[in-house]
C-alpha cells in the first residue's frame, strides 16, 4: 500500500487551531513538477457534505513529503469530507477523514467502518441531543433509510446493512428531520472487495494475517498497519510518537500523538493513534489494553508487563505476542519483512534461526507462494544463529506474494512469513526528445513514460549512426536530467534509443523504440566586412560587403544584414538568399535615423561571426508638398509656375526643387532649384517652342520633401530651338521681376 | 415508473373486517414510510394510518386506532391495512401513498380501493 | 387531530389569480415546513402540486405557489384556466407522526 498518512488535529476548542497534515512516505513523493511524482493534494470534498461558504482554506507545503491546510473559521467549517491524494501512476491513492462535529445531534459511536464482502454491518448514531423527529439516514447524499424516533435503542439509532457489497462503500448520515445537516453523525462505510481473510482478483490468495489490527488490502494481499506498527503482518510496534509504514514520521508537539486522529489507505480507514482512545483522541488506553483505539488487549503470559503502546513486553527467556514462546523453541532471527527481486533473477535469500537443540541446515526450509519447497544449499554456522542459504531459480511474476521460512527442531517449530515483491524492470514507451540541435552535438530530453516497475535509478541512451553496423555508443545519465551527445558529425542522422534500470541485479529494462535524430550543418565561419553604404532617400540605403577568399567551396546559403535602431530599440532583419551577393538594398527605413548596420553569413540555422559594426545616419524626410502647382505660358520659351506653400511645416524650407520634362520623352528630367523658399511664382525660360512639358516641384528643409502634383502645359508658337530651360522667379503677389 | 395499486375494497357488514393491500413498484418498498389515505363520499381527505420501513414503527389516526393495523412484507412490495369492527363511517375510498424520502409529504398515491359498510 | 381549516369554496374567472388559505396550530404548520398541497379532479386519486410550502414538483405550472406566515399556509393560482377547477387539500405533518388535511376547497372557474 501507498505510504500516506492524513493526520487531523482534533484540539478543537478553536476551530482556527485545527490542522490537516497529508504525510507521504514514498520515495519522490509530492515533488509535482518532476516527471516521477505527481504532487500531494489535500482539500475539502464538497459533493456529499456542503458546508456554508467562508474564506478560502490555506495550503501550505513542507518540503516535498507534506502538506498542510488550515484556515478554518468557525466549527462548521470543519464539519465534512476531507481527502488527501499521493502516490504516483497506478499507485497513486486517496485517503478520507470525516469530521464530525462535536455538537451535533447525533453523534457516530465509530465514525469508520471496515467490513468484508457480505458481512452485516451495523451503523450507530447516538443520540446527543434529542428531538422527538424522524431519523433520516443517507448514503452518498442520497435519502437511505427513515427511521422513528421511537425505534431508538438505548439512545442509539442503528442502521443494519446486511450482506454489503464494495459498491455499499461510501459516506453515510444519520440526521434529524428537518435538523441542519451539520447537526448529522457522519460515517465512512468501507467494504473489503473479498471475504474475510482473502484477497486477489477472485479472492483465491490467502491473506497474511494481519496484526495489531492491521487491515489486509483486497488488492495486494498486504497489511495496512495501524498508526504505531509496521512490518509486513504489522508485528513489530514503533517507538511511541512515531508512524509511517516505516515508523519514519514522528507527531508533533510534546504530548506526541495524543488529541490526532490518523487516516490511512482503505481498507484501514481512520483511527486514533497507537495507545489513544476516544471520539477526540485524548484518553489514554485503560490498563490491559493497547494499539490504536486501543482496541487490543495484552493478556501477556510469563510475567509479561502491557504497554499501551507496543502490547506485551517480555521478561528474559521468552517472547511472542503474548510472551507465551519460551526463547528454546527455535524463532527465525531478524528476516526482513519485505524483499524485493527484478524479474528473472536468481536471488539468493538467506534464514537464520536460533534455538536449543541448534537449528541446523536441514532444519530449515523456504516456501513459495505457490507451494513449492526449497531446501537451502548451504549453512552458516555461528554460535549463536544458523544461517541457511537458499538459490532461488529464475523469478516469474507468479513469485510474487508471501513466501515462508520455517524452521523446525525438536523443541518445536517457527516460521516467518515476509512479502516477495518480483518487479518488472522498466521498458521506454515512447523515444527520448530531441531540444536542440548543433552541427556536432545533440541536446536530448532522455523522461519517458514506461511500462514496468520504478523508481527509475539509471538512463542509459545508446545512438550511432543511422544505418551504421558500427557499436552502439553509450552514455549513463541522471534520471532527471537532459543529456548532451558530443562530438558528432555534422548533418548526420544518429539513431537513439534510451534504456532505463531500476535498482537491484538484473533491473535493467529492454532498449525503448529507436528515433532518428540530425545534427546541424556546419556553423559558417567567415566573417565579411562591410565595404561601403550610401543613401539613396531618406528611407533606402545601398549596403555592400566583401568575403574573404579562401580555397574550397563557401560554407553559407545566404547573408543576413541586421540594422539596430538604438533610439527605439527595434532591429531591422533583410536575408539575402544568394551566397553570391555582395550588395543589398534596403528600403522602408526610417527617415532622420541613427542605425548600426553589420552582416553575417547563414548556413542552414546557424549564423556566421557578424562584420564589424558600422553607423549610418539617415536623413531625415522632408516638407509636406507644395499645393495648388499651376502652370501658365508665357511666350514660346517661357512659361510660368506658381503655388502656394506647403502646410504643416516642421520647419523653415531651404528652397524649392522643380522638375521638369517632356511630355512623352525619353530623357532624364531636369531638375531647377529655386533658392529663394519665400518665393510662390517662377518662370522657366529657355523652353522650346509649341511642346508640351510635366511640372512637378517639392520643398527642402533637412532632407527633400514630398513632390506635389504634376502640371502640363505647352509653349507657345513656333520659335527657335532654345539651349535649354532655366528659371526665374518672382513674388507672384506683388508681380515685380526679381 | 412509480406504481401503487390498491386491491381488498369491497361491501361489508358493520363489524366485519376487511383486508386492503397495496402494491408497489418502480422503487425501493423497504426504505420508504408508507401511508394509509382514506376519503368518505363527497368528503375531504382523512390521513389513516403510516407504517415505518422497519415496520417497528406504527402510528394511527385516533377514530381508527384499536380498530386498524398497518403491516408490509418488504419481501413483497406490499403494504397492507387489517381493518376490523368496521363501522358505517369507514365507508370511503382507500389511497395507498407513499412518502416522500426525508420529507414530510405524500408525494405518489394509488387509484384507491372503495371500502362500503353497510347492512 | 383535528382537520385544518379552508374555506369551503372560491371562484374566479379565467385570468384571474384566486388564494386558498389553511390555518393549523403550533403543532402542525406552525412546527414544520412540511406543508403540502393537493389537487384532485373528480374520481381520481390526489396529485401534489406544492410541497414543503413552497416547492413545485416538476411538471407543475409556476402558476401555482405556496407561502405560510406564522400558522397559516396559503396556496395562489394565477392566470386561473378551466383545468385548475378541482378541489384543493392542504396538508400538514405534525409533531406526532402524523399527518392532518384541510377539509378542501372546491374552486369554481367562472
Known amino acids: 500500500a501507498v505510504d500516506l498518512t492524513l493526520l487531523a488535529n482534533l484540539r478543537l476548542t478553536d476551530p482556527q487551531r485545527f490542522f490537516l497534515t497529508c504525510v507521504s512516505g514514498e520515495a519522490g513523493a509530492g515533488r509535482g513538477s518532476d516527471a516521477w511524482g505527481p504532487p500531494l493534494l489535500l482539500e475539502k470534498d464538497d459533493r456529499i457534505v456542503r458546508t456554508p461558504p467562508g474564506p478560502p482554506l490555506r495550503l501550505a507545503r513542507n518540503g516535498s513529503h507534506q502538506v498542510t491546510l488550515r484556515g478554518f473559521s468557525k466549527p462548521s467549517d470543519l464539519v465534512g469530507v476531507f481527502s488527501c491524494v499521493g502516490g504516483a501512476g497506478a499507485r497513486r491513492t486517496r485517503v478520507i477523514y470525516v469530521h464530525n462535529s462535536p455538537g451535533a445531534h447525533l453523534l457516530p459511536d465509530k465514525v469508520t467502518h471496515t467490513v468484508n464482502k457480505g458481512d452485516t454491518a451495523v451503523l450507530s448514531a447516538r443520540v446527543h441531543k434529542e428531538k422527538q423527529t424522524d431519523v433520516i439516514w443517507k448514503s452518498n447524499g442520497s435519502y437511505f433509510y427513515t427511521l422513528d424516533w421511537h425505534e431508538a435503542q438505548d439512545g442509539r439509532f442503528l442502521l443494519q446493512l446486511p450482506n454489503v457489497q464494495p459498491p455499499s462503500s461510501g459516506i453515510y448520515s444519520a440526521t434529524y428531520l428537518e435538523a441542519s445537516p451539520l447537526g448529522s453523525a457522519f460515517f465512512r462505510l468501507i467494504v473489503r472487495g473479498c471475504g474475510a481473510g482473502r484477497w486477489g482478483p477472485g479472492c483465491t490468495k490467502e491473506c497474511p494475517g494481519c496484526l495489531h489490527g492491521g487491515v489486509c488490502h483486497d488488492h495486494d494481499g498486504e497489511c495496512v498497519c495501524p498508526p504505531g506498527f509496521t512490518g509486513t503482518r504489522c508485528e513489530q510496534a514503533c517507538r511511541e510518537g512515531r508512524f509511517g509504514q516505516s515508523c519514519q514520521e514522528q507527531c508533533p508537539g510534546i504530548s506526541g500523538c495524543r488529541g490526532l486522529t490518523f487516516c490511512l489507505p482503505d481498507p484501514y480507514g481512520c483511527s486514533c493513534g497507537s495507545g489513544w482512545r476516544g471520539s477526540q483522541c485524548q484518553e489514554a488506553c485503560a490498563p490491559g489494553h493497547f494499539g490504536a483505539d486501543c482496541r487490543l488487549q495484552c493478556q501477556c503470559q510469563n510475567g509479561g508487563t502491557c504497554d499501551r503502546f507496543s502490547g506485551c513486553v517480555c521478561p528474559s527467556g521468552w517472547h511472542g505476542v503474548h510472551c507465551e514462546k519460551s526463547d528454546r523453541i527455535p524463532q527465525i532471527l531478524n528476516m526482513a519483512s519485505e524483499l524485493e527481486f527484478n524479474l528473472e533473477t536468481m536471488p539468493r535469500i538467506n534464514c537464520a534461526a536460533a534455538g536449543n537443540p541448534f537449528p541446523v541446515r536441514g532444519s530449515i526450509e523456504l516456501r513459495k507462494p505457490d507451494g513449492t519447497v526449497l531446501l537451502s544449499t548451504k549453512a552458516i554456522v555461528e554460535p549463536e544463529k544458523t544461517t541457511a542459504e537458499f538459490e532461488v531459480p529464475r523469478l516469474v511474476l507468479a513469485d510474487s506474494g508471501f513466501w515462508e521460512c520455517r524452521v523446525s527442531t525438536s523443541g518445536g517449530q517457527d516460521s516467518r512469513r515476509f512479502k516477495v515483491n518480483v518487479k518488472v524492470p522498466p521498458v521506454p514507451l515512447a523515444a527520448p526528445r530531441l531540444l536542440t540541435k548543433q552541427s556536432r552535438q545533440l541536446v536530448v530530453s532522455p523522461l519517458v513514460s514506461f511500462s514496468g516497475d520504478g523508481p527509475i535509478s539509471t538512463v542509459r541512451l545508446h545512438y550511432r549512426p543511422q544505418d551504421s553496423t558500427m557499436d552502439w555508443s553509450t552514455i549513463v545519465v541522471d534520471p532527471s536530467e537532459n543529456v548532451t551527445l558530443m562530438n558528432l558529425r555534422p548533418k548526420t542522422g544518429y539513431s537513439v534509443r534510451v534504456q532505463l534500470s531500476r535498482p537491484g541485479e538484473g533491473g535493467e529494462g529492454a532498449w525503448g523504440p529507436p528515433t532518428l535524430m540530425t545534427t546541424d550543418c556546419p556553423e559558417p565561419l567567415l566573417q565579411p566586412w562591410l565595404e561601403g553604404w550610401h543613401v539613396e532617400g531618406t528611407d533606402r540605403l545601398r549596403v555592400s560587403w566583401s568575403l574573404p577568399l579562401v580555397p574550397g567551396p563557401l560554407v553559407g546559403d545566404g547573408f543576413l544584414l541586421r540594422l539596430w535602431d538604438g533610439t527605439r530599440g527595434q532591429e531591422r532583419r533583410e536575408n539575402v538568399s544568394s551566397p553570391q551577393a555582395r550588395t543589398a538594398l534596403l528600403t522602408g527605413l526610417t527617415p532622420g535615423t541613427h542605425y548600426q548596420l553589420d552582416v553575417q553569413l547563414y548556413h542552414c540555422t546557424l549564423l556566421g561571426p557578424a562584420s564589424p559594426p558600422a553607423h549610418v545616419l539617415l536623413p531625415p524626410s522632408g516638407p509636406p508638398a507644395p499645393r495648388h502647382l499651376h502652370a501658365q505660358a508665357l511666350s514660346d520659351s517661357e512659361i510660368q509656375l506658381t503655388w502656394k506653400h506647403p502646410e504643416a511645416l516642421p520647419g523653415p524650407i531651404s528652397k524649392y526643387v522643380v522638375e521638369v520634362q517632356v511630355a512623352g520623352g525619353a530623357g532624364d528630367p531636369l531638375w531647377i532649384d529655386v533658392d529663394r523658399p519665400e518665393e510662390t511664382s517662377t518662370i522657366i525660360r529657355g523652353l522650346n517652342a509649341s511642346t508640351r512639358y510635366l511640372f512637378r516641384m517639392r520643398a527642402s528643409i533637412q532632407g527633400l520633401g514630398d513632390w506635389s502634383n504634376t502640371v502640363e502645359e505647352s509653349t507657345l508658337g513656333n520659335g527657335l530651338q532654345a539651349e535649354g530651360p532655366v528659371q526665374e522667379s518672382r513674388a507672384a503677389e506683388e508681380g515685380l521681376d526679381q | 415508473e412509480v406504481q401503487l395499486l390498491e386491491s381488498g375494497g369491497g361491501l361489508v357488514q358493520p363489524g366485519g373486517s376487511l383486508r386492503l393491500s397495496c402494491a408497489a413498484s418502480g422503487f425501493t418498498f423497504s426504505v420508504y414510510v408508507m401511508s394509509w389515505v382514506r376519503q368518505a363520499p363527497g368528503k375531504g381527505l382523512e390521513w389513516v394510518s403510516s407504517i415505518y420501513p422497519s415496520g417497528g414503527g406504527t402510528y394511527y389516526a385516533d377514530s381508527v386506532k384499536g380498530r386498524f393495523t398497518i403491516s408490509r412484507d418488504n419481501s413483497k412490495n406490499t403494504l397492507y391495512l387489517q381493518m376490523n369492527s368496521l363501522r358505517a363511517e369507514d365507508t370511503a375510498t382507500y389511497y395507498c401513498a407513499r412518502r416522500k424520502a426525508a420529507a414530510g409529504y405524500l408525494d405518489y398515491w394509488g387509484q384507491g380501493t372503495l371500502v362500503t359498510v353497510s347492512s | 387531530q383535528s382537520a385544518l381549516t379552508q374555506p369551503a369554496s372560491v371562484s374566479g374567472s379565467p385570468g384571474q389569480s384566486i388564494t386558498i388559505s389553511c390555518t393549523g396550530t403550533?403543532?402542525?404548520?406552525?412546527?414544520?415546513?412540511?406543508v403540502s398541497w393537493y389537487q384532485q379532479h373528480p374520481g381520481k386519486a390526489p396529485k401534489l402540486m406544492i410541497y414543503e410550502v413552497t416547492n413545485r414538483p416538476s411538471g407543475i405550472s409556476n402558476r401555482f405557489s405556496g407561502s405560510k406566515s406564522g400558522n397559516t399556509a396559503s396556496l395562489t393560482i394565477s392566470g386561473l384556466q378551466a383545468e385548475d377547477e378541482a378541489d384543493y387539500y392542504c396538508?400538514?405533518?405534525?409533531?406526532?407522526?402524523?399527518?392532518?388535511f384541510g377539509g378542501g376547497t372546491k374552486l369554481t372557474v367562472l
Open positions: 403550533s403543532s402542525d404548520i406552525g412546527a414544520y415546513k412540511h
Open positions: 396538508s400538514s405533518y405534525t409533531s406526532r407522526n402524523t399527518w392532518v
